[in-house]
């Protein structure tokens, strides 16, 4: 056979044997001579580089570029491929000659006991055992152990050939220690060379650092670094690490694989570095690198170094957070320290606790902040080593969009007498205050007779062309008053009034307040009437268990039939038209009422008593009366407000405090409750009774103690009661100093 | 910057032998796998041999294995190819390569080896 | 082994316009983890060969956005959009999912 590339100038070198296969048997003489057109090399089996002692390359005495190679006695293991070609170049002829040795069938490696396999577990890959025949039609089978496996050429991915081996998917053998081949001769079995499995891996997945980021040390302490490494199976790990002071001398590393779950795709190795006593020399990146021959991966940790422990707070501390009610609040405790430090929070003094509302950690956080939430938190830092603190105030402020204090009224709704000045008021509470609160007016037929337009409860009026009250035209004159600020229920709150000089038309007004969080609205229903006129006797709004009257009193030359009705509970009107007041339309929702009547010079009064009013007996009163020559009925109607009965309590508390003589005190003591409670205050559980020094103003609600004395220290009790019982506060008052003798000072005393 | 320069190329006889240095720069060279990757005139590129961060774990191409030995020393930052048994088809450009999660991302130069009598 | 088969042998361009090369391999390159792992090697003449792709699609540090690289578990493609007189040479593929690692024949890219 010829290999190379023919060439213009040069024939291939020709061998005396003319063939692609030459057989011969053991212990005869093998000689093949080469014939060519300029310098010639053999090579031969098993030792490529000449220096075999059996073999004899000799120059042909016949002429000019020519060699015989003789083997004299050949064996089995000159079994091969013998090679003739021009120096420096790729020319040459090859022939390949079996030595037919029967009882040594398999060609032996130079000097090899056993050879070595390498394999990969993979489905796909077929792996040579080299037992080359020295005979080229033997029945070859492969024997792998342990346990003890034959398998035989199939024609198809397992087959034996002489001059490549035995070929078999490495998987079959991929459990087995060692392969040989075996041949049947005659009933005789010969072994080839034992060959060692090495299955062979490389692929790793991860390198991960544990552990793997922030890691802070103070000087002196141990750093311990674990690095794994997770792999395929049948991989050799080799681990290296990278870091500040390479040459450390109190380092120390340790290798070792990981136990890994049988049945496990999966090998984990483990490296760790442990230095002991670090120092500041030491900070850096930390690079653990581990590599199987074929793949390397790393990963790195930045290790930080401090001189000692310490806590301090970050720069992106809050001092001021800012919140609308209902909204969740995060105030995280930004700080640098180490080690990390203990967290505290607290609000206006006391200590917070985590519960389903708040959770008090790393970050302050508020699920649903209300205004109460307002305040003061202080959060304070310790460091678990040096016991170190570091406090840091945040103030916390809850906006409250523009909330309007007068229920909003869907229908019916009171109606005003013809040509009557009245006021309509919008309370509104709001943080910060309202920037602004502005009234709307619309006439009540444009609004109610929409049909395009549904009802909801959240939008009973669905009016859309609001004018503003500036332009009165067509309806009633107006005057906004400039609002007022009071104090209701112990928050301020901001009144803004809208004066009608005359009721003369129905109208809708609306009131609509305005802050940084939100807007709030109140639509009020201004439905003028000529008819009777309603009347509350004693006119405020009564409370559980007292009694009122509901006076309806109306001309007795216009009208007759005065009846009083209570509105009973209804759904919303389906229809648009039928807004705002369709209650003289629709007598089945009213309820006849039991009432007494009276009569002056000009007109007749129905009164309706109510005994001991009760929450049930809220809502709308109507009072009928028809018009003696029409016969067309007028109906008036009035929203009644019964005031639950609430223990008095007292918002805010008395807070311990310290004085020096001569100075002054004040406190506030702010009680609500219904009926309003009476405040009384106690000194060491007497009574506090006023004099020149001690003062009590706003209904007991302030207290001052005017140039204090060290006898006015004590326990001081604000105490605030009604029929429904009694809520109180205490606060220790201390005086400090010495009492000075001056026969000048006028000093109070106690009773 | 990362440098890798090859060095020990030249002209052997077949059957002889040769080693090959890389010189690594630039780089932990510890902290790196190794291969050697060449290129006979006009062949594709044929991966050689590879060898662990320590030196601990090596893989030879079936073509070259038994004959070639790859090996490393840190301390002096330098990849070796030793080759024995030289073949006419060993001839080649002989590149070292740095290798990280698989990838060649630098390679030397190359060092020509020629295999002739 | 894995035989990997480039094509076309040569591809002549003009500067500015785009080209793409194929790489085919004899088995699935996408690894059980999910990723492919065949990558784009450019030799310039007279240079050693420079890692352009990995993982079959993700850019090597500093090579320009003009290289992309996409494909499925067996075919494969090098995109350069707006070809520019530096990136003549040879371009090869390599595959990385079983050992050993085996190159692309090359595909020699040269301007008309």
């Known amino acids: 056979a010829s290999v190379g590339l023919p060439s213009v100038s040069l024939d291939l070198p020709r061998l005396s044997i003319q063939k692609d296969i030459l057989t011969i048997k053991a212990n005869t003489t093998l000689q093949i001579t080469c014939r060519g057109q300029r310098d010639l090399d053999w090579l031969w089996p098993n030792n490529q580089s000449g220096s075999e002692q059996r073999v004899e390359v000799t120059e042909c005495s016949d002429g000019l570029f020519c060699k015989t190679l003789t083997i004299p006695k050949v064996i089995g293991n000159d079994t091969g491929a013998y090679k003739c070609f021009y120096r420096e170049t790729d020319l040459a002829s090859v022939i390949y000659v079996y030595v037919q040795d029967y009882r040594s069938p398999f060609i032996a490696s130079v000097s090899d006991q056993h050879g070595v396999v390498y394999i990969t577990e993979n489905k796909n890959k077929t792996v040579v055992i080299p037992c080359l025949g020295s005979i080229s039609n033997l029945n070859v089978s492969l024997c792998a152990r342990y346990p003890e496996k034959r398998f035989v050429p199939d024609g198809n991915r397992i087959s034996w050939d002489s001059k490549k081996g035995f070929t078999i998917p490495s998987y079959m053998i991929s459990y087995a220690g060692m392969v040989f081949c075996e041949a049947k001769i005659n009933d005789e079995s010969y072994q080839s060379i034992m060959y060692i499995v090495v299955v062979v891996g490389y692929r790793i997945y991860d390198v991960v650092l544990s552990p793997s980021h922030g890691i802070e040390l103070s000087v002196g302490e141990k750093l311990v670094l674990n690095c794994t490494a997770r792999t395929e199976l049948n991989v050799g790990i080799d681990f290296n690490w990278e870091y500040p002071s390479s040459k450390h001398q109190h380092k120390k590393l340790v290798n070792r694989d990981l136990k890994t779950q049988s049945g496990s795709e999966m090998k984990k190795f483990l490296s760790t570095l442990t230095i002991d006593g670090i120092t500041r020399s030491d900070q850096g990146l930390y690079t653990c690198a581990a590599s199987s021959g074929l793949m390397t991966k790393k990963n790195s940790t930045f290790v930080r170094v401090h001189e000692k422990p310490f806590v301090a707070f970050g720069s992106g501390m809050e001092s001021l957070v800012e919140a609308t009610v209902g909204e969740r609040v995060r105030i995280p405790a930004k700080y640098l320290g180490y080690p990390p430090p203990e967290i505290k929070w607290y609000k206006n003094g006391i200590p917070l606790e985590s519960n389903h509302t708040i959770k008090a950690g790393h970050v302050l956080t508020i699920m649903e902040v209300s205004e109460r939430d307002t305040g003061n938190y202080t959060v304070i830092l310790t460091n678990p080593i040096s016991k170190e603190k570091q406090s840091h105030v945040v103030s916390l402020v809850v906006y409250v969009p523009p909330q309007i204090g007068e229920k909003s009224l869907i229908s019916p709704v009171d109606s005003y007498q013809y040509g009557t000045t009245q006021t309509l008021t919008c309370t509104v509470y709001a943080i910060p205050p309202p920037h602004h609160i502005h009234w709307y007016w619309q006439l009540e037929e444009e609004c109610a007779n929409e049909p395009s337009h549904a009802v909801s409860v959240t939008n009973p009026y669905p009016c859309e062309e609001w004018r503003s009250v500036e332009d009165f035209q067509g309806g009633n004159k107006i005057e906004v008053n400039k609002n007022q600020f009071a104090l209701i229920e112990g928050k301020n709150k901001t009144v803004s009034t809208l004066v009608i000089q005359a009721a003369n038309v129905s109208a809708l007004y609306k009131c609509e307040a305005v802050n940084k969080v939100g807007r709030g609205e109140r639509v009020i229903s201004f439905h003028v009437t000529r008819g009777p006129e309603i009347t509350l006797q004693p006119d405020m709004q009564p409370t559980e268990q007292e009694s009122v009257s509901l006076w309806c009193t109306a001309d007795r030359s216009t009208f007759e039939n005065l009846t009083w009705y209570k509105l009973g509970p209804q759904p919303l009107p389906i229809h648009v038209g039928e807004l705002p007041t369709p209650v003289c339309k629709n007598l089945d929702t009213l309820w006849k009422l039991n009432a007494t009547m009276f009569s002056n010079s000009t007109n007749d009064i129905l009164i309706m008593e109510l005994k001991n009013a009760s929450l049930q007996d809220q809502g709308d009163y109507v009072c009928l009366a028809q018009d003696r020559k029409t016969k067309k009925r007028h109906c008036v109607v009035r929203q009644l407000t019964v005031l639950e009965r609430v223990a008095p309590t007292i918002t805010g508390n008395l807070e311990n405090q310290t004085t020096s003589i001569g100075e002054s005190i004040e406190v506030s003591c702010t009680a609500s409750g219904n009926p309003p409670p009476q405040i009384m205050w106690f000194k060491d559980n007497e009574t506090l009774v006023e004099d020149s020094g001690i003062v009590l103003k706003d209904g007991n609600r302030n207290l001052t103690i005017r140039r204090v004395r060290k006898e006015d220290e004590g326990l001081y009790t604000c105490q605030a009661c009604s029929v429904l019982g009694c809520a109180k506060v205490e606060a220790f008052f201390i005086i400090e100093g010495a009492q000075e003798k001056t026969n000048l000072e006028h000093h109070h005393h106690h009773h | 910057e990362v440098q890798l320069v090859e060095s020990g190329g030249g002209l052997v006889k077949p059957g002889g032998s040769l080693r090959l240095s890389c010189a690594a720069s630039?780089?932990?060279?510890?902290?790196?796998?190794m291969s050697w990757v060449r290129q006979a005139p006009g062949k594709r590129l044929e991966w050689v041999a590879s060898?662990?961060?320590?030196?601990?774990?090596?893989y030879y191409a079936d073509s070259v294995k038994g004959r070639f030995t790859i090996s490393r020393d840190n301390a002096k930052n330098t990849l070796y190819l030793q080759m024995n048994s030289l073949r006419a088809e060993d001839t080649a450009v002989y590149y070292c390569?740095?290798?990280?999660?698989?990838?060649?991302?630098?390679w030397g130069h190359g060092t020509t080896l020629t295999v002739s009598s | 082994d894995i035989v990997i088969t480039q094509t076309p042998l040569s591809l002549p361009v003009t500067p500015g316009e785009s080209v793409s090369i194929s790489c085919r391999s004899s088995?699935?390159?996408?690894?059980?983890?999910?990723?492919?792992?065949l990558n784009w090697f450019l030799q310039r003449p007279g240079q050693s060969p420079q890692l352009l792709i990995y993982?079959?699609?993700t850019r090597a540090s500093g090579v320009p956005d003009r290289f992309s690289g996409s494909g499925s578990g067996t075919d494969f493609t090098l995109k350069i959009s707006r070809v520019e007189a530096e990136d003549v040479g040879v371009y090869y593929c390599?595959?990385?999912?079983?050992?050993?690692?085996?190159f692309g024949s090359g595909t020699k890219l040269e301007i008309k």
């Open positions: 993982l079959m699609s």
């Open positions: 060898i662990s961060i320590g030196g601990s774990y090596t």
């Open positions: 390599q595959q990385l999912v079983e050992y050993p690692f085996t």
């Open positions: 630039g780089f932990t060279f510890s902290m790196y796998g």
């Open positions: 088995k699935s390159l996408l690894y059980k983890d999910g990723k492919t792992y």
């Open positions: 390569a740095r290798e990280m999660d698989g990838n060649y991302d630098y």
